[in-house]
């Protein structure tokens, strides 16, 4: 049971959001007095793996050499010392890419804006999906989704940016996913170029929820704005 | 090269099974792409049968004539798509190509076709 | 379900003629709609893709345009080698479709 232990750190290398059939390391660091780790998958029997410690004891690693949807999901770890078991770890989702083709990103009317202007992203995918994610790359907070409800699947999702302004410029993707699991992903779109001309004195957008207070001008969110243009998707912010 | 080679076709009698292959060369059947099955049967129009994502999951779809008698699968290790076909009936004899959704949403590459007789 | 009506089924024409197909989609399908020629015993060929973007290595007399649920094919002037069928498809896939092509038009010499 879960005692007075501080817990765990849990986090994956190279990253959290991987590709299918490369290989991914599952790292836990607790304490010195571990004597074990056990990792659990949510959804999956308990435990889901265990692994002695590595020296000096404060960490151990769980290995993936091959990612595949199996090993998609929400992960938490905790350690044993003499005293009993940790808290659980924050948790740790692992996404897989490459679970589906990969969808079509474009800018309508076009990639080249004016400042102040308005521009949509539009991702598209030739089967039904029910979510679309876009990812500015270099973004801290890179995630936007646009969530299909009641089951019913599009295909497409409009991201819509009004006043654009120069933070908004920069090299974006989008991927799609199916009802099957939200931790598989689609391969990611080509890259689409979004070039915003005109006053390089742009102001800030002022968000319509910050996702992070300290965030500078790379870091800031994607901020849609207007209602969502299929009315069965839901707009979902990470 | 580039290309896409059926094979498995022949003459098979009403109610029985067959099972068609579509070899991919010059690229990867688990790369990015939809392989469709399309068939064409004698002096008619090109009828979709269905299709598989290349994404791992491999999510298909059917034509809703199809009503499960036809599956397609696939091999990533030969680089192969199947076609599995059973009940077959007279109206099924046809040409049958398989074809790659490019990134244009179009089929950009078609094999040259098998063909295939139902009859007693 | 999306329904693919293509017109005419059959059209004369001579060398040097202008030639115009027309296909129909029951929904819009936005510009995600190809073009094909087939020859008899040969598989198809794409033409056009996306509704206007020339396929490489394509004569310049084709053209295709149109977005939502109308949409052309031209030949600007009829060549030897165009005497074919034609066949427009949607690019979308999903369980609820009977077909993805139009049914067809032949293109033969007057």
């Known amino acids: 049971q879960a005692g007075p232990l501080p817990k765990p750190t849990l986090w994956a290398e190279p990253g959290s959001v991987i590709s299918w059939g490369n290989s991914v390391t599952i790292w836990c660091q607790g304490t010195l007095e571990a004597r074990e780790y056990r990792l659990d998958k949510e959804e999956s029997p308990a435990p889901w793996d265990r692994q002695n410690p590595l020296e000096p004891k404060n960490k151990a690693r769980f290995s993936i050499p091959s990612m595949t949807e199996d090993y998609a999901g929400r992960y938490r770890c905790y350690y044993r010392s003499p005293v009993g078991w940790s808290q659980p770890s924050d948790p740790l989702e692992l996404v897989m890419t490459g679970a589906y083709s990969k969808p079509t990103l474009s800018a309508l009317p076009s990639p080249l804006v004016t400042s102040g202007k308005s521009v949509t992203l539009l991702c598209q995918s030739r089967s039904p999906m029910d979510t679309f994610l876009l990812i500015k790359e270099r973004a801290a907070h890179p995630l936007l989704h646009l969530r299909s409800e009641h089951g019913a699947q599009q295909h497409q999702a409009e991201f819509p940016m009004s006043p654009v302004t120069s933070v908004h410029g920069g090299t974006y993707r989008c991927f799609s996913s199916h009802g099957f699991s939200h931790y598989l992903l689609s391969h990611p779109s080509d890259p689409l170029e979004l070039i915003v001309s005109g006053s390089l004195e742009d102001p800030r957008p002022s968000p319509t929820r910050s996702v992070s207070t300290a965030a500078g001008p790379e870091d800031q969110p994607l901020m849609p704005t207007g209602s969502v243009p299929h009315s069965g998707l839901r707009r979902h912010w990470e | 090269e580039v290309q896409l080679v059926e094979s498995g076709g022949g003459l098979v009698q009403p109610g029985g099974s067959l099972r068609l292959s579509c070899a991919a060369s010059?690229?990867?059947?688990?790369?990015?792409?939809?392989i469709s099955w399309v068939r064409q049967a004698p002096g008619k129009g090109l009828e979709w049968i269905g299709s598989?994502?290349?994404?791992?999951?491999?999510?298909?779809y059917y034509a809703t004539w199809v009503k499960g008698r036809f599956t397609i699968s696939r091999d990533n290790s030969k680089n192969t798509l199947y076609l599995q076909m059973n009940s077959l009936r007279a109206e099924d004899t046809a040409v049958y190509y398989c074809a790659r959704h490019g990134d244009n949403w179009a089929l950009d590459l078609w094999g040259q076709g098998t063909l295939v007789t139902v009859s007693s | 379900d999306i329904q693919m009506t293509q017109s005419p089924s059959t059209l004369s024409a001579s060398v040097g003629d202008r030639v115009t197909i027309t296909c129909r989609a029951s929904q819009s399908i936005n510009s995600w709609l190809a073009w094909y020629q087939q020859k008899p015993g040969k598989a198809p060929k794409l033409l056009i893709y996306?509704?206007?973007t020339l396929a490489s290595g394509v004569p310049s007399r084709f053209s295709g345009s149109g977005s939502g649920t109308e949409f052309t094919l031209t030949i600007s002037s009829l060549q030897p080698d165009d005497f074919a069928t034609y066949y427009c498809?949607?690019?979308?896939?999903?369980?609820?479709?009977?077909?993805?092509f139009g049914g067809g038009t032949k293109v033969e010499i007057k």
């Open positions: 598989i994502d290349s994404g791992s999951v491999g999510i298909t």
């Open positions: 498809q949607h690019g979308y896939i999903r369980g609820d479709l009977d077909n993805v």
């Open positions: 996306k509704a206007s």
């Open positions: 010059g690229f990867s059947l688990s790369s990015s792409y939809w």
